[in-house]
């Protein structure tokens, strides 16, 4: 039994990270592999992670972390029964991949202005809370060339854009993910999407 | 190993205050983020509120806000819960419970608030 | 605040049953649900977390799945031991919620 790719790991930079890797053959990861992991300082305790398999020969770990700072960095080893099959280290800070945003929002109430909102997936505490960005991806369900990113540079959780931009009378669908450039992080994956049906008032028309 | 050992509970009249202890042994407090969890007699688990180990953060729950006060100190490994403004409803089992979600809990102190 | 509603709130069951326990968040909380078992005068544990992963120690005839806000606790072949009453746990954001709880009795 070997590893065919090594274990990489990202972190939601607060209380998990997920670590893949692939064997060299079919494997049940559950029963015949486990995953260590410790906090490098004194005293720290080793951790077990039994993990999932991702396809015939993919493996998936959860690693339960408490609050994570820059300077946070775990051993990881990886088992099989009693054979040592992988060695490696992973520090947080340095793969993050953000949490995704919730709660998205469409307020179509505004005098022809689409105004989406949505939360912040970390509480004001964490680090990442004050340096996210965004990215909205906006797509019609009647045509799938209809697709378009508005990215959102700023903080606030919102974005506005005129109904007129979009075709009126048809359905859209909005999404939203972040990204935070202080920690070259990933994006975090899509939230989920929500629907609502564009219409406005077309200007009047003097001939 | 891991230990929490819980106290400070017992019986108070409703209005009046009780601060309850917790102390952790067998690993290194000060790199651990703790809660404090509840349970009234017959009924369910309740969060009550969280510290956190990197910022000092604490949150609550909306039953305890502005009555109840989450601290600690690293130096004697000890986690705290000032209870002020007690009510008939804040009777329960009292546990501390460490991060990473709750991986270890103290055995518990009963508070009961009745007059 | 999220609220976590499980389902059944009590239930009877036999040795060798499979037993399914749901909870359903109020809003969308990715993987960040963990369920915890409670037998009666003892400490909560801690038996799955992230939706899915096996607490290190816990028998593998619990498993857990879901994510967004379905989520599902299995017992795949009920043991003596299992009776107890099971929690869902919410950690996506604060204030951290649990379910009410639900009771596996003997049949």
């Known amino acids: 039994m070997k590893v065919l790719q090594e274990p990489t790991c990202v972190s939601d930079y607060m209380s998990i990270s997920t670590c893949e890797w692939k064997m060299n053959g079919p494997t049940n990861c559950s029963t015949e592999l486990r995953l260590l992991y410790q906090l490098v300082f004194l005293l720290s305790e080793a951790h077990t992670c039994i993990p999932e398999n991702n396809g015939r020969a993919g493996c998936v770990c959860h690693l339960l972390m408490d609050d994570v700072v820059s300077a946070d960095n775990y051993t990881l080893d990886l088992w099989a029964g009693q054979q040592l099959l992988w060695k490696g280290s992973f520090k947080p800070s340095e793969h993050v991949k953000p949490r995704a945003p919730g709660n998205l929002t469409v307020h179509t109430n505004v005098s022809d202005t689409l105004l989406l909102t949505w939360s912040n997936p970390y509480p004001p505490d964490n680090y990442l809370y004050n340096h996210l960005t965004y990215a909205v991806n906006i797509w019609s369900e009647n045509d799938p060339a209809d697709f378009r990113i508005y990215n959102v540079t700023y903080l606030e959780p919102s974005l506005r854009i005129a109904a007129s931009t979009l075709k009126s009378g048809i359905s859209y669908r909005a999404r939203v993910r972040a990204w935070a450039q202080c920690y070259n992080t990933t994006w975090s994956e899509w939230s989920p999407s929500t629907k609502w049906h564009n219409s406005y008032r077309e200007p009047f028309e003097q001939h | 190993q891991v230990q929490l050992v819980e106290s400070g509970g017992g019986l108070v009249q409703p209005g009046g205050s009780l601060r309850l202890s917790c102390v952790a042994s067998g690993f290194t407090f000060s790199h651990s983020s703790m809660n404090w969890v509840r349970q009234a007699p017959g009924k369910g688990l309740e969060w009550v509120s969280y510290?956190?180990?990197?910022?000092?953060?604490?949150y609550y729950a909306d039953s305890v806000k502005g009555r109840f006060t989450i601290s600690r100190d690293n130096a004697k490994n000890s986690l705290y819960l000032q209870m002020n403004s007690l009510r008939d409803e804040d009777t329960a089992v009292y546990y501390c419970?460490?991060?990473?979600?709750?991986?270890?809990w103290g055995q518990g102190t009963l508070v009961t608030v009745s007059s | 605040d999220i609220q976590m509603t499980q389902s059944p709130s009590a239930m009877s069951a036999s040795v060798g049953d499979r037993v399914t326990i749901t909870c359903r968040a109020s809003?969308?909380?990715?993987?960040?649900l963990a369920w915890f078992q409670q037998k009666p005068g003892k400490v909560p544990t801690r038996l799955i977390y992230a939706a899915s992963s096996l607490q290190s120690g816990v028998p593998s005839r619990f498993s857990g799945s879901g994510s967004g806000t379905e989520f599902t606790l299995t017992i795949s072949s009920l043991q003596p031991e299992d009776f107890a009453t099971y929690y869902c746990?919410?950690?996506?954001?604060?204030?951290?919620?649990f379910g009410q709880g639900t009771k596996v009795e003997i049949k």
């Open positions: 746990l919410q950690w996506s954001s604060y204030p951290r919620t």
């Open positions: 419970a460490r991060e990473p979600v709750f991986d270890y």
């Open positions: 809003q969308d909380i990715s993987n960040y």
């Open positions: 510290i956190s180990r990197a910022t000092g953060a604490v």
